[in-house]
């Protein structure tokens, strides 16, 4: 019944595939596929696979993102992760007592190694593995601000759950600040939400990486899943291009 | 340089204009422009203009919204507003004492008149006119839940300011709940954010509609700018169409 | 009386000129353009002799594909069986039957078109639209199409009946 | 919505998201992307009718605007609506890199 | 971005947002919309080149992807990116209504 020209579906697919070839190279700012001459034999390192899986899980958890993206977001972002400083570090000593909070500190030298310039950071997420939770809990995230003051960042209402679950907080602005400042160690605090009337301010939720008494392999596995910052940033070498073409079409 | 046919800009404009003719009628679910036979002479009523301006201001304040919209959002939304129950109403008596909170109650019969079915509501905003503020203040919004309990909804960090400013909180889910329930009067509480350590929990911010001692015209003007709910909803008669065509292309 | 035309000279542009009336104004339109419904603007007249595609209906989501014929005038399409007329999936819906627009496009009613080449006493003659010739293969599948005045008949083989929705001869389910 | 749920299970001729799996090795001849081996890129295809709308239009035609020309374009076009990113692993020299490419997977389409 | 700031001040031939003010009375012959009298609808227009990209492509060509075919479409098309709603006031009988129409004003375009 149709008078339209029949669409050559195979041609459309071929053109889409060829466009994707260019798109991927273009997003990675590569003129041609990278040489594979230095790639060692064998599978990817465990840590790389873990990072890839973290990123893939994040994507699956996101709702399909509606389009608009600033020019810089068109280009690929390198994904790295920086683990929280281990809890036996002396920095934690003066914050050990509280029942309503847990503390997470990060080495800014590790952050700078991953993201040399604040402007290169496009997203930073604080990822916490929440263990089983019997009751609903309202938690708040704070950033260490000055000597002993904390700045409120965000909050989350945690539903009871029988299975562990990754929590993710967007802390892009904070990490960008840290990269701009000279501090050596910076931190977050996760607290129970305290209302002005209520006096029951205990943090019920158990976050992986803070439970004591583990030994051997279990402690290692547990430690690998301790809180970390998932960073997405434009690699330095790619950023140079961006600046030069900033106001061009 | 171009191999394309020259674009007839006038034809494109004409086609865009004609498409807009159909789009507006279609969004309003009108088969043709409405008859103007009953329109009273003279300018639009003040209240209507105020409502139009509120809506227009909201649009200007929004960043340009990226597209995707569910089918129901394609159609026009009727905008209405429901003012907070005045503060001399007895409902406020038992909540007068607190230094850390102010209370806002709404008549659900007025809400139901504006939006007969919860499913028709597409957005509800609580609008508060914030007066001058000398210091930064972190405030939290709660919903009245059961007898004397309050459920946390959201928070806002208010920067110091010399000029009044409208604050807007998205309370769509809450108003939808209210429309589903049988209650006669429902309310919100705006509180100072109380941290677990700090004891300075005074609500510093002055919200229009709560300051006492005004008389005459000033009180009236002041009252008109008291907190209100801005509602966007699909009119009932338009909703019937939507249901019947729900799963069709 | 306010003279709207002198107040706003662009009122009927770009395809017409403004004419002031008591309490209002109308547009006098250029060749090839006709006044809008309220006579406050000019829109292009689709030349009835342009030949385009005739679309069967708007019920089906794939109405771009439901083409009755490919080389017909707006009158031949809209004054007979068509729901819309255009090409490349760019569609002018046919006016609703019995509306003023329908009468303007099809002054002699359903099934007839005006033939400007034959003029009787200064009035264009009307001629029956031969649906079988224009749409035969699409409106009477598996049957024999016979033109009538106005309209058409579709005769099916024994054991088949004509389905007016499908526009084809369908096997009688015994 | 013209999403994978609707489009992959229907024979929609108009604008819809169409299935397309890209295997980096087979389709692009690339062995340098170590993870994933391929991905469901999908694409948008199908006509978006332009309807010349006169005031005399009846509701049936106006109802078509929502799907076929919701943006009232002069030449509506079938384009992606919801997109998702794609993380990849590849080597630069001896160093494996995890990178995320934005807007790579088409989940739904729209006439725009 | 192919937004009003860039496009209205340039002579861009490729995909860009173009100015279009619609006066309800003059352009549509409508007097029934009481507020506003008209609005800046704008529209998207201009080609989005499709670039056949072979691995031999040099960076100059690949750099064009960002603007001309960022979504790697088989037939990229110039369409709205950022849109804004339009509130209107009109009467139904004797009753004035304020309604908001979504996605009516084109603020920027993209090749998609």
């Amino acid at each position: 019944l149709s008078t339209c020209k029949t669409i050559d579906m195979e041609l459309v697919k071929r053109k889409r595939i060829e466009a994707i070839r260019g798109q991927i190279l273009s997003k990675l700012r590569l003129a041609s596929p990278p040489s594979q001459g230095e790639v060692p034999p064998g599978p990817l390192p465990e840590a790389v696979l873990a990072l890839y899986n973290s990123t893939r899980d994040r994507v699956a958890g996101e709702s399909a993102e509606p389009e608009p993206e600033p020019e810089a977001d068109y280009y690929a972002k390198e994904v790295t992760r920086v683990l929280m400083v281990e809890t036996h570090n002396e920095i934690y000593d003066k914050f050990k007592q509280s029942t309503h909070s847990i503390y997470m500190f990060f080495n800014t030298s590790e952050l700078r190694e991953a993201v040399p310039e604040p402007v290169l950071l496009s997203r930073a997420e604080l990822r916490l593995l929440r263990l089983k939770l019997k009751v609903e809990q309202h938690v708040e995230l704070y950033q260490k601000y000055s000597n002993n003051s904390w700045r409120y960042l965000s909050n989350r209402l945690l539903a009871p759950s029988d299975s562990p679950e990754w929590l993710s907080f967007d802390v892009t602005g904070v990490v960008r600040q840290w990269l701009s400042r000279g501090g050596e160690i910076e931190g977050f605090r996760l607290s129970a939400h305290c209302s002005c009337d209520s006096r029951d301010n205990t943090l019920q939720v158990d976050i992986n990486g803070f439970t004591t008494g583990r030994r051997g392999d279990l402690a290692t596995i547990h430690g690998m899943n301790r809180p970390f910052l998932l960073l997405m940033a434009t690699p330095l070498e790619r950023a140079q291009h961006l600046q030069s073409s900033r106001h061009r079409r | 340089l171009s191999t394309c046919k020259t674009i007839d800009m006038e034809l494109v404009k004409r086609k865009r204009i004609e498409a807009i003719r159909g789009q507006i009628l279609s969004k309003l679910r009108l088969a043709s422009p409405p008859s103007q036979g009953e329109v009273p002479p003279g300018p639009l009523p003040e209240a209507v203009l105020a409502l139009y301006n509120s809506t227009r201001d909201r649009v200007a304040g929004e960043s340009a919204e990226p597209e995707p919209e569910p089918e129901a959002d394609y159609y026009a939304k009727e905008v209405t507003r429901v003012l907070m129950v005045e503060t001399h109403n007895e409902i406020y008596d038992k909540f007068k004492q607190s230094t850390h909170s102010i209370y806002m109650f709404f008549n659900t019969s007025e809400l139901r008149e504006a939006v007969p079915e919860p499913v028709l509501l597409s957005r509800a905003e609580l609008r508060l006119l914030r007066l001058k503020l000398k210091v930064e203040q972190h405030v939290e919004l709660y919903q009245k839940y059961s007898n004397n309990s309050w459920r946390y909804l959201s928070n806002r960090l208010l920067a110091p300011s010399d000029s009044p400013e409208w604050l807007s909180f998205d309370v769509t889910g809450v108003v939808r709940q209210w429309l589903s329930r049988g209650g006669e009067i429902e309310g919100f509480r705006l509180s100072a954010h109380c941290s677990c350590d700090s004891r300075d929990n005074t609500l510093q911010v002055d919200i229009n509609g709560f300051t006492t001692g005004r008389r005459g015209d000033l009180a009236t003007i002041h009252g008109m700018n008291r907190p209100f709910l801005l509602l966007m909803a699909t009119p009932l008669e338009r909703a019937q169409h939507l249901q019947s065509s729900r799963h069709r292309r | 009386d306010i003279d709207e035309c002198s107040q706003d000279p662009s009122l009927c542009l770009p395809h017409g000129a403004c004419k002031n009336l008591q309490g209002s104004y109308v547009c006098v339109c250029d060749e090839g353009f006709t006044p809008t419904q309220d006579q406050h603007g000019c829109e292009e007249v689709e030349q009835p002799h342009h030949k385009k595609e005739c679309y069967l209906n708007f019920d089906d989501t794939v109405f771009c594909d439901s083409v009755l014929a490919t080389n017909v005038t707006q009158q031949e399409c809209c004054c007979s069986l068509g729901a819309g007329w255009g090409d490349h999936c760019e569609i002018y819906p046919c006016p609703v039957y019995s509306s003023a627009e329908f009468h303007s496009l099809c002054p002699d009613g359903k099934g007839y078109t005006q033939d400007n080449n034959i003029v009787n006493y200064g009035i264009p003659a009307h001629r029956d639209i031969d649906e079988c010739m224009l749409f035969g293969s699409e409106i009477c599948k598996e049957g024999k199409c016979v033109n009538t005045q106005p309209g058409y008949e579709c005769y099916c083989k024994q054991g088949f009946y004509y389905d007016g929705n499908l526009l084809e001869c369908v096997d009688v389910d015994e | 919505a013209l999403d994978t749920n609707y489009c992959f299970s229907s024979t929609e001729k108009n604008c819809c998201v169409r299935q397309l799996y890209i295997d980096f090795r087979k389709d692009l001849g690339w062995k340098w992307i170590h993870e994933p081996k391929g991905y469901h890129a999908n694409f948008c295809l199908g006509p978006c009718p332009y309807i010349w709308s006169l005031d005399t239009q009846y509701s049936k035609v106006l109802a078509l605007y929502n799907q076929h020309n919701p943006g009232a374009s002069a030449a509506p076009c079938c384009v992606p609506q919801a997109l998702e990113p794609l993380p990849i692993v590849y080597y630069v020299g001896r160093k494996p890199k995890v990178e995320q490419l934005s807007n790579m997977i088409v989940r739904s389409c729209k006439c725009s | 971005a192919l937004d009003t700031n860039y496009c209205f001040s340039s002579t861009e031939k490729n995909c860009c947002v173009r100015q279009l003010y619609i006066d309800f009375r003059k352009d549509l012959g409508w007097k029934w919309i009481h507020e506003p009298k008209g609005y800046h609808a704008n529209f998207c227009l201009g080609p989005c080149p499709y670039i056949w990209s072979l691995d031999t492509q040099y960076s100059k060509v690949l750099a064009l992807y960002n603007q001309h075919n960022p979504g790697a479409s088989a037939a990229p098309c110039c369409v709205p990116q950022a849109l804004e709603p339009l509130p209107i006031v009109y009467y139904v009988g004797r009753k004035p209504k304020v309604e908001q129409l979504s996605n009516m004003i084109v603020r920027s375009c993209k090749c998609s």
Partner: antibody
Framework: EVQLLESGGGLVQPGGSLRLSCAAS????????MTWVRQAPGKGLEWVSA????????YFADSVKGRFTISRDNSKNTLYLQMNSLRAEDTAVYYC????????????WGQGTLVTVSS | DIQLTQSPSSLSASVGDRVTITCRAS??????LNWYQQKPGKAPKLLIY???NLQSGVPSRFSGSGSGTDFTLTISSLQPEDFATYYC?????????FGGGTKVEIK
Amino acid sequence: EVQLLESGGGLVQPGGSLRLSCAASGFTFADYAMTWVRQAPGKGLEWVSAISGSGAATYFADSVKGRFTISRDNSKNTLYLQMNSLRAEDTAVYYCARVSSGHWDFDYWGQGTLVTVSS
Amino acid sequence: DIQLTQSPSSLSASVGDRVTITCRASQSISSYLNWYQQKPGKAPKLLIYAASNLQSGVPSRFSGSGSGTDFTLTISSLQPEDFATYYCQQTYTVPLTFGGGTKVEIK
């Protein structure tokens, strides 16, 4: 067209040395890791050694570790295998091959050169 | 070292037959397995890489499957030019190792 051409094979006494060469053409030599594989008469294939594109990384089978060295000259598009302390069990046809990707499949092979270790 | 065991070590088949060769690894090697064909007096030729990917230019009657420890090379319809020896190879870890080979002869 990709071409690999081995040379340098021959008869050598146990304990002696030999240097095999593989001349490559038809591709960007420095972009690919290269490898040597051998096949004793009437036997199966045995992997011997490999080298990364820049020559920075080398890999060896246990049976040749400490006796053989692999190297490359990217300016000459040539791969080398220096074989010292040769034994009778090193007698085989030696093939050079291109490592096609990070997956380490050998997509192009030379025609082979015969090394005979015998007194 | 990872051992690869091919079976059978030899088989006789006719033109048009479907032939299946298996390769078992002494530990899991994911999909890091390649298949090669070698004819007498010639260099080996890559058929399948990464367990299931057909190398460019290889006829589609050849296919590979498997993951972990068990892998299969299938020739759907044996042709006269397919009579040769077939080797599997693991690239999961150094040292890289080959299977002992399977000789496909004319029945």
